[in-house]
């Protein structure tokens, strides 16, 4: 009897949908695996007789519940199927946005770039998929614990009237208000402000 794959799960970030599993202990030799997806009531092969422990399902439609399954194989024997259900638009993890930061005197000018999507045109981003897409920005004075959050209305934001000659750190994430779903924070970007722009009288 061939044991089934273990710890079968979907790892999906920005619609890069990778079905992953672990190979069970099997004394007779090396196992291969077949992964399938349900399409119009028929299971279709996606990865056949692979020695890998993952299979790329990024070409699935973003909408709807998909039934995926994987089994282990050895010679003419095979395990039972292990099934999972996956809805990309609901289940995919929202990866961190890109961010450009520029210092202008005592202000930080930030521009945000929505995450790109696997198997899509360069310009079709997570912002196109989710109508309610917005950004959360978090910033703090470097070396302090107090963090401030803002929700920009656009793809850019300016933090004004900051303390001069002080290092501020900023990070951004995508947020979907209609789903109350937050994405992953970007890596902090830390920049030092320069002089106060006010002109002495």
């Amino acid at each position: 009897m061939v044991p089934p794959p273990e710890n079968v799960r979907m790892n999906s970030v920005n619609f890069k949908n990778i079905l992953q599993w672990e190979s069970p202990a099997f004394a007779k030799g090396n196992l291969t695996f077949t992964a399938q997806y349900l399409s119009y009531r028929i299971f279709q092969d996606k990865c056949m007789n692979t020695t890998l422990t993952e299979c790329d399902f990024s070409s699935l439609s973003k909408y709807g519940d998909h039934t995926l399954r994987v089994r282990a194989e050895f010679a003419d024997e095979h395990s039972d199927w292990v099934n999972i259900t996956f809805c990309p638009v609901d289940d995919t993890i929202i990866g961190p946005p890109g961010m450009q930061v520029e210092v202008l005197a005592d202000s930080l000018h930030m521009r945000f770039l929505a995450p790109k999507i696997e198997n899509e045109y360069e310009t079709w981003t997570m912002k196109n998929v989710y109508n309610s897409w917005t950004y959360n920005v978090q910033y703090w004075k470097n070396g302090t614990d107090e963090k401030f959050q803002i929700t920009p209305q656009y793809d850019f934001e300016v933090l004004r009237n900051l303390e001069p000659w002080t290092t501020y750190c900023v990070q951004v994430r995508g947020f979907l208000p209609d789903r109350n779903k937050a994405g992953e924070w970007s890596e902090p970007v830390c920049e030092q402000t320069t002089h106060d722009e006010t002109v002495p009288s």
């Epitope: 909408y63 310009t123 196109n128 109508n131």
Partner: nanobody
């Protein structure tokens, strides 16, 4: 049942232009995303372009960027693909597709309704 009808294909010389049209027979073409795809002889389906109804944004495959332009005329319920500077490698059957949910642009899996296609041949 929605029926998409493409027109405007034909034979054109390299460097020439064509304008393809996509209309919904007896229906409004009121879908979140309308896309154009093509299939060259012996090859798979390839995404060419799409237009989003929500913001009017347009998106293109690298291979056609700067040469093709997608647009829509809501009064005529028609989406167009203007193809300029045509090359031999643009020869294919071109399909129009409509998405009910508008979540994707390039992947055929994200589209729900398809036309029958129109042949474009670029040859001297």
């Amino acid at each position: 049942e929605v029926q998409l009808v493409e027109s405007g294909g034909g034979l054109v010389q390299p460097g020439g232009s064509l304008r393809l049209s996509c209309a919904a027979s007896g229906n409004s073409l009121d879908y979140p995303t309308i896309g154009w795809f093509r299939q060259a002889p012996g090859k798979g389906l390839e995404g060419v372009s799409c237009i989003s109804a929500s913001d009017g944004s347009t998106h293109y495959a690298d291979s056609v960027k700067g040469r093709f332009t997608i647009s829509r005329d809501n009064s005529k319920n028609t989406v167009y693909l203007q193809m300029n500077s045509l090359r031999a490698e643009d020869t294919a059957v071109y399909y129009c597709a409509a998405s009910l949910f508008g979540l994707g642009c390039k992947s055929e899996a994200d589209y729900d309704y398809w036309g029958q296609g129109t042949q474009v041949t670029v040859s001297s």
